[in-house]
Structures are given as C-alpha cells and as structure tokens.
C-alpha cells in the first residue's frame, strides 16, 4: 500500500509502525480541503525587511477522523493546516483599471508544513474486520520556504539559517490521494 493522505495533503498513514519519516521534500501545491476559522498565528505581511523572523505564516487547526477506505479511526485527531502569505517583502503596485492591484516580485515564498508528529491510531472497519493499528503523521508546525524562479517547485529552500537538506538514503514513496473532498476549501491555503 502507498501512503494515503486525508483531507489535507500533509497527513499520511505510515504503514511501518516503527518508522518516523522526515517531511517530504516536494511542495504540494493543491488546495487544502477543510474549513477552519480564526487562525492561530496572524498573517504577517512584512515590507522591505530582510529579518527572517518577519516571515511567518498562519497555522490553522482542524479536527477530523482518519479514514482509510471504509475504515475509520476509533478516535479523532487534531492537526494544523498551513495557510496565509509569507511574503516576499517587496510588493509592486500594478494598476488595473480604477482599482489598484498588488503583485509580489522577487522569490516566491510558500507556507508549508515544517514539523510533523507521529501518532498511533486504531482503525475500525465494518463487517467484523479486526481493528488495525496505524501510525499517522500529523502536521505540528508550519514554515515559510522560498521558491526561486530559477528552481523547480520541488527544490524549496528553508527561509532560515539552514538550507533544505536533501534526504539521504531514502527512496521517494508514492503518495495516494484521497478521493474524498467533502469540505469547502480553506481560503488562501498555500
């Protein structure tokens, strides 16, 4: 079985219970499917600053049951979804008609999952099937990462002191998408 993602693309079921994988290096650029309100960290829109601490993004939380086909977790989980704008600092005016539109210039910054927390859940299945133990990876924090125009989207750079570390000794795993998208899309996600 491949990894299965549910509702937000960062949460994965991990078949090997003993494994604690690092976050995937690629950027998932599709929208997050959940509904959250009143985000935890306010969005930051810094202007003309090089200070790393000025770049931040919103961490919205949501609550759900983990599902795997017809099976559902005995207990729900809570995790974060990363949202909001990270910059860049420079915004150039771009007049269109009467109204003024603002577009970012320079490198592209994305708010994406940074830290994950592995949690064991018990999946209950219909038809008298035995419960199954699974370890899921829940988003615990978010971070702004920089995508330069000269790089592919998979080559994200941490906006911080350390550059994105290549994963050593790990083969990329296939990630199956969940077909269920039964909640409204989060505004401004990613």
């Amino acid at each position: 079985q491949g990894w299965q993602a549910f509702k937000n693309d960062a949460t994965e079921i991990i078949p090997e219970l003993g494994e604690y994988p690092e976050p995937p290096p690629e950027l998932e650029n599709n929208k997050t499917m959940n509904r959250a309100e009143n985000g935890g960290r306010p969005p930051h829109h810094p202007f003309e600053t090089k200070d790393v601490s000025e770049y931040s993004c919103r961490e919205l939380h949501f609550t759900r049951y983990v599902t795997d086909g017809p099976c559902r977790s005995a207990k729900p989980v809570t995790e974060l979804v990363c949202s909001g704008q990270c910059g860049p600092a420079r915004l150039l005016p771009n007049a269109i008609g009467r109204g003024k539109w603002w577009r970012p210039s320079g490198p592209d910054f994305r708010c994406i999952p940074d830290r994950y927390r592995a949690q064991r859940v018990q999946l209950l299945c219909p038809g008298g099937e035995a419960p199954r133990a699974r370890k899921v990876r829940l988003v615990a924090s978010c971070k702004c990462k920089r995508l330069t125009r000269f790089h592919n989207q998979s080559e994200l750079k941490d906006f911080g002191t350390e550059a994105a570390r290549p994963q050593k000794g790990r083969k990329p795993r296939p990630r199956a998408r969940s077909a269920k998208a039964n909640q409204a899309e989060l505004e401004n996600a990613y």
């Epitope: 009143n38 989980v77 809570t78 974060l80 927390r117």
Partner: nanobody
Framework: EVQLVESGGGLVQAGGSLRLTCAAS????????IGWFRQAPGKQREVVAS???????YYEDSGKGRFTISRDNAKNRVYLQMNSLRPEDTAVYYC???????????WGQGTQVTVSS
Amino acid sequence: EVQLVESGGGLVQAGGSLRLTCAASGRTFSSFVIGWFRQAPGKQREVVASITSGGSTYYEDSGKGRFTISRDNAKNRVYLQMNSLRPEDTAVYYCAAAEPAGVYDVWGQGTQVTVSS
C-alpha cells in the same frame, strides 16, 4: 491528568438555543485542544467544533454559522453555544481533549441534547 464533564444539555424546541459547557480539571488544561463531538442514535460519532489554547477555532459544516465554540482558560471551561437548533441536532454531545497535533484521548461522559419539532 485532565478530566472532562459536560453540562447544559436538555430538551429544546426547534429554533431554540442551548449553551453546553465542558468543565475540565487539571492544571494543563490550557495547553490542550478541546473538541465538541456528537453522536446521534444509530450513527457514528462526528466532529462538531474544536478550539486551540490560542483560540483558533474549527467548525464542521453542520454547525457552521449556528454554533460558536469558545473557551475560558482561567475557569478551565470550553463552551458550545448552539443557536437555531434543528431536530437533526438531537444527539449526545461530548467534549474531548487532545494535545496539539495529537489524538483526542480524554473524553467526557456526554450530555443529551434533544430538539423537538
């Protein structure tokens, strides 16, 4: 160890309001994410709303615009204000606690909400 007790349930007519309270004991209450869940007869338990220690809230579509979750960390309480109640809101309502990015492991005993048409 956090313990949770729900109160405020009862019988109400459609269109009416109720305010549920989840009272917690335990010094670490403020660091937990608290969620409200409900279970109607013959149905699976479902998410209603949740709130983090910082006040970030989440609502399922079923209660969107009608339900409001709030918390008072000083009093170790979380509230669910339910307005414009419908018969389909009839269920046992539970509150539960989870560490951030974690599983809801601590549950209350539930409080019955019945909405008559």
